[in-house]
Every structure is written in structure tokens, then in C-alpha cells.
Interface confidence: medium
């Protein structure tokens, strides 16, 4: 067992670590998210720039300076390409967030046009016929009970909406989109502990050939691209989706991560490659948005001044455009997308970020230089709730995002998306299919605390993301009734 | 159709523990979601706990919390509730419902298992 004194002869402070977890039992067992890990341990060593810690055996550095992140991020981001994550390219392995950095350069390029302002804009009326059904099925609940569990209700909505922009599939029951989501859920929820035998022993999953994976979500995966691909009879469609520029793909049979094109560092694109893919929109467009905008809906439901401001809001400008809500309105819903960002700031969904040095590596503004394959992490739920950068940061207050006070503070200061090239490729998708239903919602209803909402929501220790322990309870109340 | 069927309730003991079941059968795809409920004579009925078959999410109600677990067994289709510490408070007729995704309207419901707590 390696011994825990590489941190010590390196003279970086850090937590003591236990016997077998390094400083992430409680993650290991399970009783705390890695987040809310992370973010402890930001915060046990409030005037150092990097804490050593071990994720299990292996030591790896959590950056709190923020001028550090900005160096590991954007400035020298071709030292930290690669997200570190080890385990097989079979099976789901090589998507587009595991990859490392060359696989990623060769996807990125070509993934990066499906989110231009031009193709979103041609989603939105996906996004809008979803979110008119979502707002109809909640309408029909709410006879029976005004009670919803939003988090998960809200997943049906992402569900469809991800289907539709991405895939071209209608879930035309709720019984079908159900079976979806339920096979989906899986990979989020189930506890494997693969991950933590990386980061006991890296490259270990790689050499194995293990996935993270449960099989079922890989044939889930595999059978969704079969039926595509014979319903384009395996060519692009002309509907410039997601599915199109992968069936665009195919046909080129490989993609090359320098613009050279040089074959020495060429992916080929294998059905294995596609469902990949396929794998990481549905997992990144459904329950980052669905957890997000539940987030937020407990926000408002607990402070109704600020609801009562974007219900103002809202109708304001749906009623000087006939009603409708446009992709062009939801930009222009200032407080709202104020009040989205404070919502990312206080749940900030993937966590921790993390990075591999490619190369040896000296931290700037420190005496501390870390080895090759070193994993660098970055707590943004440590950062976004640090008193130094926001003021109550307990306190849900949209107003901390205007564009004045947002100047005034260090640009890694948020990090809900990541930061620089390696970022969230679909953060506008996010926004924009999380504002158009929170539109819909407010158009119609208000949403208030209801006898079980929990007024002290812990964060779900069982999965990969943040999300909300037993989810979030809460009354949606049709405008009718209150005005 | 759902059907449900509770059993384990009974007399018990001030600070005895007991583990109440209830099986689920007929169409449980339909089912997101199984909640245990309860009712105190004159009372209104309550919702103590709640866990989800896919993801195993769970919610507890703040008057139950850290003396009620609930837990799942996929294969059986049975959901369990195990009560420690029991107080005569605890006494009343629990009911286990399914509900499906995202609502809070229990569209399936067992038939009740009495629980008395003697002091």
C-alpha cells in the first residue's frame, strides 16, 4: 500500500488522510456526495492556494486560487487536456466528457456546430412543444393533487426535449419516456465503486478493460442507435440534429484531433464510439437541466419575493409578444437568467472538476511542481459558497449576477460549466431548454413550499451528481386560483 | 392495475422495532414510487417515507427521520419499513401506495397492517 507522506515531502498542507480512503471515506461509503466532500475539504485551509489531498491512495492537488485555476483551466489548459478519468474506451468510455485530450480534440471539433445560435434556435420549437406537453400534464395533475416531486416530474420534461433535439425520437406515452428514464437513472444512481478503484489504482479499470457502466445502459444505448441509424437507413436525414452530424461521422469512418489531419492521431468512428456519444447527450441534456431547474423551483417556492419579481417579469414580455415565449424572449428575461445563474451557483451539479497534468508542472505562485499524471481538482461548490467571493452565500439572491457585481469579481469565481476550452459544450442547450419550461411554469403557476418540502435539503450521497436527497416537494398552485 | 399487500404490523412493545412489507404485483412498471403512510385514530393520514425503484431515491418525513428505514427489494417487488425505538405515538394502521413519477398523488393502495404500541 503506497504510504501517504507524498504530500508531507512536498511540503503542501493537507487533511490527514484514514487508512485505504485517503481523505474520501465518506464518499466511499457512500454517506456524503463527492462534492459536498470536496467543498469540506476547500474549506479546511481557508489561506492556502493548493491543499494535497488522497482520493483513496493516490495524491492528487485541490486548487483553491483562483488565480491558479485560471492558469490550469485557460492559460496553460494544454497541460491539463485530459480529465484524468481511466477506464476502458469500450462500452461507453470514449464519450465526449471521459475522453482523454486527443479523443476529445477529434470530437469537440466536431460536436461544437451542433450548439451554434442557428441550430438552437431550430430546437426551440422541439423544446417548446415538450415543455407545452409538460406544462399540460402538470395542468391535469394538479386537479388531482398540488403537490409535485418536482425533480424527478422535471426529468420527463428534459427527457423529451433531449430525445426530440437530439435523436428525433417522440415519446409519445409517458409509460415509454418512463421505461427511458427509469433504464437512465441507473447510471446515475447505481453505487459502483469502479471509480474508486481508479483512483486507488489508476489505469487499473484501462488495463482490465472495466467499464463504469452498468450493461444495461449500454444496450439501452446501442439498441436507441441501431433504430436511428436504420430509420436514416444510415445516412443524415437533413434534420442537422445531433444524429445527423454522427451519421456524418460515420460515413467518414474517422476523425482527426489536429487540423492537419494526420492519421497518427485519428479516432475511428466504431458504432462503440457512436453509442458513446449518444450516452453523454442523453446523461448531460437531461438530468443537469432537470436537477437545475428543480433547484430552482425550491428556491422560489421558499422566497416568494423574488418569484413575485420573475412572475412580473415573465409577463411582462409575454404580454408584449402576444403570449408567446421565443428563443429571442427568454434572452431577453434579464432577471431570470439572473436568477439561473445564482441557481448554478448555489448547486452547481458536476463536481468536482478535474484535470491530469500531462507533464510535470510547476503550480505558479508556489514552490510546489506536480509529476506527470498528477489529478488536479477544483471544488466550485467550495468556491461558490467561500464568504471572500460572495457575500451570505447561503442567501439565494439573482441580484449577486448583476453585470456590475459580476464584473467586480475574479472570473473563476463561477464555475458551474467548467472554464475554458474543455467546458460545458452544451451550456447554452441547458439554459435555454431550463428558461423556456421555468417560463412555461411561471406563466402559470406559483409555486409554494407544500407540508413536505424540506427546509434543510442535503445533497444525494449516492450519486454521481448533485442532486436533492429525496428529492424536492413542492405545491404548484395555478395562477388562477391566486390572483 | 397495482396490487398491494402489506403485512408485519402487530402488538408491540415501547421501544421494541418491527419491519412491515408490502408486496407489489399486477402492472409495477406503472409504479415510479412506493410510499408508506400511516393514521392515528382521528387523525389524519400521513405520509412517514418514500423510495423509488429505479434510483432508490428516498424521502422521510421530519417526525420519522433516523427511527424509519425504508428500503427496496427489486427482485421481490417488495418494499420494506423498519421502525426502532417505537413509541405508542407510532401507534396507528400503516398503509403502503404507489405512485407514479414526479406527482405526489398515490394512485394504488394496500389494504392497512395495525401497528399498536404498548407503553
Known amino acids: 500500500m503506497r504510504t501517504f507522506n507524498y504530500w508531507k515531502k512536498r511540503n503542501v498542507r493537507g487533511p490527514e488522510p484514514v487508512v485505504f480512503f485517503g481523505n474520501l471515506k465518506d464518499s466511499a461509503l457512500r454517506k456524503k456526495n463527492m462534492g459536498v466532500v470536496m467543498e469540506e475539504l476547500y474549506n479546511m485551509f481557508p489561506e492556502e492556494k493548493v491543499i494535497g489531498i488522497y482520493r483513496m491512495t493516490s495524491p492528487c492537488l485541490l486548487v483553491r486560487d483562483l488565480d491558479v485555476i485560471k492558469h490550469i483551466m485557460i492559460k496553460d489548459f494544454e497541460v491539463f487536456s485530459d480529465r484524468g478519468v481511466e477506464f476502458s474506451k469500450e462500452g461507453l468510455g470514449s464519450n465526449l466528457f471521459h475522453a482523454d485530450g486527443e479523443t476529445w480534440r477529434a470530437l469537440g471539433n466536431r460536436f461544437t456546430p451542433i450548439f451554434t445560435s442557428g441550430k438552437l434556435k431550430n430546437m426551440f420549437y422541439l423544446m417548446h412543444e415538450g415543455a407545452d406537453n409538460f406544462i399540460d400534464h402538470v395542468s391535469a395533475e394538479c386537479e388531482k393533487n398540488q403537490e409535485f416531486e418536482v425533480h424527478s416530474l422535471l426529468q420527463t420534461y428534459t427527457m423529451s426535449t433531449i430525445a426530440a433535439c437530439a435523436f428525433g425520437i417522440s415519446y409519445d406515452s409517458i409509460g415509454d419516456k418512463v421505461k427511458a428514464l427509469d433504464i437512465v437513472d441507473k447510471i446515475i444512481s447505481e453505487p459502483s465503486y469502479a471509480i474508486e478503484l481508479d483512483m486507488m489504482y489508476p489505469g487499473l479499470l484501462s488495463k482490465l478493460n472495466l467499464s463504469i457502466f452498468p450493461t444495461v445502459v449500454k444496450n439501452f444505448f446501442k439498441s436507441l442507435v441501431d433504430n436511428i441509424v436504420a430509420q436514416r437507413n444510415g445516412k443524415p436525414s437533413g434534420r442537422n440534429d445531433f444524429m445527423d452530424l454522427i451519421l456524418e461521422l460515420r460515413q467518414l469512418g474517422e476523425v482527426t484531433s489536429n487540423k492537419y489531419g494526420s492519421s497518427a492521431s485519428s479516432l475511428e468512428i466504431t458504432d462503440e464510439v457512436i453509442c458513446a456519444q449518444a450516452f453523454v447527450f442523453y446523461i448531460a441534456g437531461y438530468e443537469t437541466s432537470a436537477t437545475t431547474m428543480a433547484y430552482m423551483i425550491y428556491q422560489l417556492a421558499l422566497n416568494p419575493d423574488i418569484q413575485n419579481k420573475l412572475i412580473a417579469e415573465v409577463d411582462e414580455v409575454l404580454k408584449a409578444n402576444d403570449g408567446k415565449v421565443t428563443y429571442d424572449t427568454v434572452k431577453e428575461m434579464k432577471y431570470l437568467n439572473k436568477a439561473f445563474d445564482e441557481t448554478l451557483r448555489m448547486y452547481s451539479i458536476v463536481e468536482p472538476l478535474q484535470r491530469k497534468a500531462t507533464r510535470d508542472y510547476k503550480i505558479p505562485g508556489t514552490d510546489v511542481v506536480i509529476e506527470k499524471d498528477t489529478i488536479v481538482l477544483i471544488s466550485p461548490r467550495g468556491i461558490h459558497y467561500d464568504p471572500k467571493y460572495y457575500d451570505n452565500p447561503k442567501q439565494f439572491n439573482p441580484d449577486r449576477f448583476d453585470a456590475e457585481e459580476v464584473g467586480k469579481r475574479h472570473p473563476c469565481a463561477y464555475l458551474p460549466f467548467g472554464l475554458g476550452q474543455r467546458n460545458c459544450i452544451g451550456m447554452r442547450f441547458g439554459r435555454l431548454q431550463s428558461l423556456l419550461c421555468i417560463t412555461k411554469i411561471l406563466s402559470k403557476f406559483r409555486i409554494e413550499p407544500s407540508k413536505n418540502t424540506d427546509r434543510n435539503l442535503q445533497v444525494e450521497p449516492h450519486r454521481g451528481l448533485i442532486g436533492p436527497k429525496g428529492g424536492i416537494r413542492v405545491n404548484a398552485i395555478p395562477r388562477k386560483l391566486v390572483s | 392495475q397495482v396490487q398491494l399487500q402489506e403485512s408485519g404490523g402487530g402488538l408491540v412493545q415501547a421501544g421494541g422495532s418491527l419491519r412491515l412489507s408490502c408486496a407489489a404485483s399486477g402492472r409495477t412498471s406503472r409504479s415510479y414510487a412506493m410510499g408508506w403512510f400511516r393514521q392515528a385514530p382521528g387523525k389524519e393520514r400521513e405520509l412517514v417515507a418514500d423510495i423509488a425503484w429505479s434510483d432508490g431515491r428516498i424521502y422521510y418525513s421530519d417526525s420519522v427521520k433516523g427511527r424509519f428505514t425504508i428500503s427496496r427489494d427489486n427482485a421481490k417487488n417488495t418494499v420494506y419499513l423498519e421502525i426502532d425505538s417505537l413509541k405508542p405515538g407510532d401507534t396507528a394502521v400503516y398503509y403502503c401506495?404507489?405512485?407514479?413519477?414526479?406527482?405526489?398523488?398515490?394512485?394504488?393502495w394496500g389494504q392497512g397492517t395495525q401497528v399498536t404500541v404498548s407503553s
Open positions: 401506495a404507489s405512485r407514479a413519477r414526479g406527482t405526489v398523488s398515490y394512485n394504488y
